[in-house]
Structure formats: structure tokens, C-alpha cells
């Protein structure tokens, strides 16, 4: 016999990412004896909550909390019983709830209260359910990406911690109701609201971040539908051969389409609308989402929002990834350059409904949205954020890094559980448990 060194105990943390269209639960784990190390926290498991996002339960708050039960029950199994009490549990809600909070603050409060009531029934260390600001959503996504890719700090072969020379990655998140862009800059922001100062592992980071509410994929699609109803009587971004009936109340009930709402419209009226597979008209329709007319700063992205020039490499995740992945994988189109991305969007927008269905077997109703989605991503990156061909070459579209989903959830937990210290780590000796 010989002495066998037991591997260190693991700690766990749970984050419920309550997005506009659905909720996801992420369970993270890390060795208890290496809490302050970098790249140590990883995803243990995840669970997609069935049904819509919690904001869709405005009229039925208890339904929001009930929807979470299946995933919470899974968490009871995934986290060892002896670790339940010491496992922090957080719920963060994003743009769907920000929108609900704008239009119906009472309903928003009721949903959060109902969810809180259910989460406190579980044996975890529940630490609150709240709505994240757009700035937090952007910054925590940036922290997640750079933590997972070990851009903050690394353990060298000489037994020293050092800051990698490659610098940090910018982060771009395309959600259902908002989109965020976050990257490190050298000069101070002209708009203080867009700047965040971070101290991580003894290093100082000046980060630019902005969140555009109503520029998430789902809200953009809804706004384009409202525009098509107003200006065309057909939808240039939908495929020819795609025929729908639209209840006007569904189109105009979002705060994002309020500005397009006709003065005396009948919310229960149904309108027939068909697609026309017109890439050029679709591009024009998408262009109408961006305003470049005025900028109170030395430079802007769009809608008068300050943005320094994009610099360095970027990781684009969530719906950015899904859109580009559809073009690459389902359509077999190259998207390595901006020119190719535009050509791919035009290609999808030229397809008829029958052609699309033949390319992607199975009746996926949301196939009809990929033209608009691709056109929006292309326009947002090139015209909106100002990526040229050279800068676009530094953008990677990714869903996961180190087997962990890229999004704000991990960064949020790292921050709230102090897993990233502000001070630099000292010299450490590692123990090999292999």
C-alpha cells in the first residue's frame, strides 16, 4: 500500500441567467484551496428552464417561479448534498426585465418577489434576485471571456504569476432584447457612463462598455416587422413563399416598437404579411435601425453614443455566435471577412421559403428570421461599431471557452463571491494531485 493524496474539495456556485426569452442555470465549481487563482473556476453543469423568460410571466408571477423548479431540482442532484448550504445562488435578470421594469414596474417587482420566494425554499445560500444594468451585463461578459481565456494572469513555469502580454479581449454580446460591446481602452471615455475601472489581480483596467436596449435580436426582429407593416405591406427580409398572419397587438406591445405604433391602431386586428426575399430592401430596412445624424462627442457608434475606435481582438457570443454559426454550418457559407459576412447575409436573403426549408430540413419556423438576423449582425458590426476588414479579422465567434458558456453569468459570480481578488497573488507552490 501507499499513501494516496486526496484531491482537494470542490466548491460550487449557481447563477440563474434570466434572459428576455429564456432562463438558463449555470453551476460552477472550483477547488476550495485555489479560490484566488485564475482560470480555476469552470462550468460543472447547466440547465435550460422550459418556457419563456421570467418577464413573460408579468401577468402570472408565480408561473415565473414555478418554471425554475425543474432546474433547481437538478441543482440539488448536481451539487453534492454536503455542499448545498455553502453554495451561493444568484439570479440576475437582463434586458427583458429591464423593459418590463420600464413599462410595468409593479409587475417587474412582483416577478422578482415570486422568484425570490421560490429560491429561498432551496437549501442553497441564496444571495438575491435582481435586474442587472446594461453596464453590468457588458462588463461581466468581458470578465467571463478574459477569465476563461486566462488573459488577466497566468501561472508561469517558474512558479510565478504573470500578466500575459497578449492583452485582453473585447466582448460583444447579442441577447434577445439588448446588445453589449465592452473592450479595454487606453484613453478616458468622453462619456463617463461608458467607462468602468476594474482592479483585478493587482492590475488596473480601463474598460469601455455600452449596452443598447432594444437592439437584441428578438427586439430588432420585432422592430423590423413593425417597419415592414408600416412601409411595405410585405416583409423584404422574410423569404418569398413565407405567409403569416400578424396580430397588431403582438407587434406593438413592446416598448421597443412603441415609436412605430400607429396612432389609432386596433390591437386585435390581424394583418396578412408575406415575405419577398429582397436583400437590398432588407438592408435598407435594417439600416433604419441606426441613426448617425448627430454625435455630441468626438466620435460615436450610433444613436449619438460615444465609442472609442474598436481595438484589439474580440469574442462575439450568444446570438452573434448563433447567427454566424447558422451561416457557416447550416448554409455552408464562408464568413471569415466582413465582405463574406455581407455576401452570406445577401445569400440567405435571396432564398425562398422552399429553398430554405430544403437547406435546413425540419419545419423550423424561425428559419424565416435568419436573413434579418444576419443582415443586422453585419450592419451592427460594420456600420454600428465601426469594424473594418482588419479589425473584423480579430473577431472570433464563440459559444464556449474551456467548456464553459461565455456570457455574463460567470463574471457575475466571480465578482460577487470575490473569486477575483483586487490584489496580486503572492508566490505559491503548486501541489500535483494527479
Amino acid at each position: 500500500t501507499r499513501d494516496v493524496r486526496e484531491p482537494p474539495a470542490l466548491k460550487y456556485g449557481i447563477v440563474l441567467d434570466a434572459g428576455s426569452s429564456h432562463t438558463s442555470m449555470f453551476i460552477y465549481k472550483w477547488p476550495a484551496d485555489k479560490e484566488n487563482d485564475t482560470g480555476i473556476v469552470g462550468q460543472h453543469s447547466s440547465c435550460d428552464v422550459p418556457g419563456g423568460g421570467i418577464s413573460s410571466y408579468a401577468d402570472n408571477p408565480s408561473g415565473a417561479s414555478q418554471s425554475l423548479v425543474g432546474c433547481l431540482e437538478q441543482a440539488l442532484q448536481d451539487v453534492p448534498k454536503e455542499r448545498h448550504a455553502g453554495t451561493p445562488l444568484y439570479l440576475g435578470a437582463t434586458a427583458g426585465m429591464r423593459l418590463l421594469n420600464l413599462t410595468n414596474p409593479e409587475a417587474s417587482t412582483s416577478v422578482l418577489m415570486a422568484v425570490t420566494h421560490t429560491l429561498t425554499q432551496y437549501p442553497f445560500d441564496f444571495r438575491g434576485a435582481r435586474i442587472l444594468s446594461g453596464q453590468e451585463e457588458g462588463v461581466f461578459g468581458w470578465v467571463t471571456a478574459n477569465y476563461l481565456l486566462e488573459n488577466f494572469i497566468k501561472y508561469g513555469w517558474v512558479g510565478r504569476w504573470f500578466r500575459p502580454r497578449k492583452g485582453t479581449l473585447g466582448a460583444m454580446d447579442l441577447g434577445g432584447a439588448s446588445t453589449q460591446i465592452t473592450f479595454e481602452t487606453t484613453s478616458p471615455a468622453e462619456d463617463r457612463a461608458s467607462e468602468v475601472q476594474l482592479h483585478l489581480y493587482g492590475q488596473h483596467y480601463r474598460v469601455y462598455t455600452h449596452s443598447f436596449l432594444c437592439y437584441g435580436r428578438d427586439q430588432v426582429l420585432q422592430r423590423l416587422l413593425a417597419s415592414a407593416l408600416q412601409t411595405h405591406g410585405f416583409h423584404p427580409c422574410w423569404p418569398r413563399g413565407f405567409s403569416t398572419q400578424v396580430l397588431l397587438g403582438d407587434v406593438y406591445q413592446s416598448p421597443c416598437t412603441m415609436a412605430q405604433r400607429p396612432q389609432n391602431f386596433n390591437s386585435s386586428a390581424r394583418v396578412s404579411l408575406s415575405g419577398s426575399s429582397d436583400p437590398h430592401l432588407c438592408r435598407d430596412l435594417v439600416s433604419g435601425l441606426f441613426s448617425f445624424s448627430s454625435c455630441p462627442f468626438s466620435r460615436c457608434s450610433f444613436n449619438g453614443v460615444f465609442q472609442p475606435p474598436v481595438a484589439g481582438n474580440f469574442v462575439a457570443f450568444s446570438a452573434f455566435f448563433y447567427t454566424v454559426d447558422f451561416l457557416r454550418t447550416s448554409m455552408g457559407l464562408p464568413v471569415a471577412t466582413l465582405q463574406q459576412l455581407e455576401a452570406a447575409a445577401v445569400n440567405v436573403c435571396n432564398q425562398t421559403w422552399a429553398q430554405l426549408q430544403a437547406r435546413v430540413p425540419g419545419q423550423r419556423a424561425r428559419l424565416a428570421d435568419y436573413c434579418a438576423g444576419a443582415m443586422f449582425v453585419q450592419q451592427l458590426l460594420s456600420r454600428g461599431y465601426g469594424f473594418d476588414e482588419r479589425a473584423f479579422g480579430g473577431v472570433i465567434f464563440q459559444k464556449k471557452a474551456a467548456d464553459t458558456a461565455v456570457g455574463w453569468a460567470l463574471g457575475y459570480m466571480l465578482n460577487l463571491t470575490n473569486l477575483i481578488p483586487a490584489d496580486p497573488p503572492g508566490l505559491r507552490k503548486g501541489t500535483d494531485f494527479s
Epitope: 428576455s20 413573460s56 413563399g241 403569416t244 396578412s272 408575406s274 421559403w353 430540413p361 423550423r364
Partner: antibody, heavy 129, light 111 residues
Framework: QIQLQESGPGLVKPSQTLSLTCTVS?????????WNWIRQHPGKGLEWIGY???????NYNPSLKNRVTISRDTSKNQFSLKLSSVTAADTAVYYC??????????????????????WGQGTTVTVSS | ETVLTQSPATLSVSPGERATISCKAS??????????MNWYQQKPGQAPRLLIY???NLESGIPARFSGSGSGTDFTLTISSVEPEDAATYYC?????????FGGGTKLEIK
């Protein structure tokens, strides 16, 4: 108000071709919608056969694809079903129906749900020698 | 194809009582956070008519006593207080994937 009416022979011999026509009134079949055929075997559930779209595209149930043709005559505002090499298993009530993608909101996410909400009264077809 | 299994095959309920019909799919009919499930009512000698779409959205003109719920593979049609005219066969139908498929039907009898 859109109305649909099926017509065609009620008795077809085995191995022959079943032919049915659906006449649409109150709406032009080229303006929109998907024009479906659905059948219901005696005492059984419903089975979707296929459709022809307002744009003249076809979509068939893979289980029947080799035997089915759905076509249209725009001058008469009609669409037709032809089912070849019939057997007793094709005995059923045949319905024509108008369908489309209903836009609806789930959460803050709009999507499209294929529904068939204009139906004919159905016509019984018996396959027998 | 997606197979839909309805239960019970027959349901006998007194007027004013609650009726619950279940529909189970062989695979998830959810996509992107939405449930592609519809419910139809077919009265004897008549064509089916749409009651509910997207799992829980009531079609216009359908009485509020009808409601739908569920997601993934498990769906339910509920009639909160059955009335004599509700005697019919009820079908679930999925539109998530080609071909669209229907359940085998549940016959609702009024005692």
C-alpha cells in the same frame, strides 16, 4: 370569410388514383396561405398529407411523398390532390384546409406557429373493388 | 417524425366540472424558447377548428374556459368548467418540425 369545399368521387378502386378538388371562395389562393390536404382514417386521428403554397411551392408528408401530387388551378381558385396506387388503407375522410404561420409572442420573442384554421367539411373516400 | 400521444382516449365529465387532456410528444416541440403546439376541437360531423396555438395562446372567439399549458414534451388542454357544447374530440398538433403531426385524439363525453 374564407370558405373551402371538397369534391370528388366517393369510391375509388384499389391501385387507381384518388383525385379530389378543393374550391376556395372569399380569398384568392395566390394571395397568401398554404393550401393543405389532411385525412382522417375511420375512428382514427388526423394525418397531414401536404400543401401547395400561394407561391406554388409544394411540401409533402415524407410517408406519402412518392404517391402524392398537389396542384392548383388559379383561374378557378381551386387546388387538387392526386394520390396514386391507392389501397384500402387510404380509405378516409379527406379535408382541405387553409394554413399559415401565425405570428405570436412568447416572452419578448416573436415566433411563427403553423396553424390550419380554415377547413372544408370533408369528403369520404372509400377504396374498394 | 414527432409522434404525439394523447391521454385519456375518452374522458367523461359532468357539466361544470374541470376536464384535463394530456399530450406527450416523442421529442421536444420547443425551439428557441417557444412551444410549437396547437390544439383543435372537432365536433361530430364537423371539420376541426383551432382552439389554442403556441401551447397557451387562445384563438380569438374561443371561450376563456379553454386554456393550454406546457412546454418541451408535455402539454395540457384544460376546460375549467365543461359545458354541454364542449362534447367533441380534441387533437393536439405540433408544428416544430416537418411533417406537422397530430395526436390520436381525446373524445370528451358529457355525462
Amino acid at each position: 370569410q374564407i370558405q373551402l369545399q371538397e369534391s370528388g368521387p366517393g369510391l375509388v378502386k384499389p391501385s387507381q388514383t384518388l383525385s379530389l378538388t378543393c374550391t376556395v371562395s372569399g380569398y384568392s389562393i395566390t394571395s397568401g396561405y398554404y393550401w393543405n390536404w389532411i385525412r382522417q382514417h375511420p375512428g382514427k386521428g388526423l394525418e397531414w398529407i401536404g400543401y401547395i403554397s400561394y407561391d406554388a411551392d409544394n411540401n409533402y408528408n415524407p410517408s406519402l411523398k412518392n404517391r402524392v401530387t398537389i396542384s392548383r388551378d388559379t383561374s378557378k381558385n381551386q387546388f387538387s390532390l392526386k394520390l396514386s396506387s391507392v389501397t384500402a388503407a387510404d380509405t378516409a375522410v379527406y379535408y382541405c384546409a387553409g394554413g399559415y404561420y401565425r405570428y405570436g409572442l412568447g416572452s419578448y420573442r416573436g415566433s411563427y406557429y403553423y396553424v390550419m384554421d380554415y377547413w372544408g367539411q370533408g369528403t369520404t373516400v372509400t377504396v374498394s373493388s | 417524425e414527432t409522434v404525439l400521444t394523447q391521454s385519456p382516449a375518452t374522458l367523461s365529465v359532468s357539466p361544470g366540472e374541470r376536464a384535463t387532456i394530456s399530450c406527450k410528444a416523442s421529442q421536444s416541440v420547443d425551439y428557441d424558447g417557444n412551444s410549437y403546439m396547437n390544439w383543435y376541437q372537432q365536433k361530430p360531423g364537423q371539420a376541426p377548428r383551432l382552439l389554442i396555438y403556441a401551447a397557451s395562446n387562445l384563438e380569438s372567439g374561443i371561450p376563456a374556459r379553454f386554456s393550454g399549458s406546457g412546454s418541451g414534451t408535455d402539454f395540457t388542454l384544460t376546460i375549467s368548467s365543461v359545458e354541454p357544447e364542449d362534447a367533441a374530440t380534441y387533437y393536439c398538433q405540433q408544428s416544430n418540425e416537418d411533417p406537422p403531426t397530430f395526436g390520436g385524439g381525446t373524445k370528451l363525453e358529457i355525462k
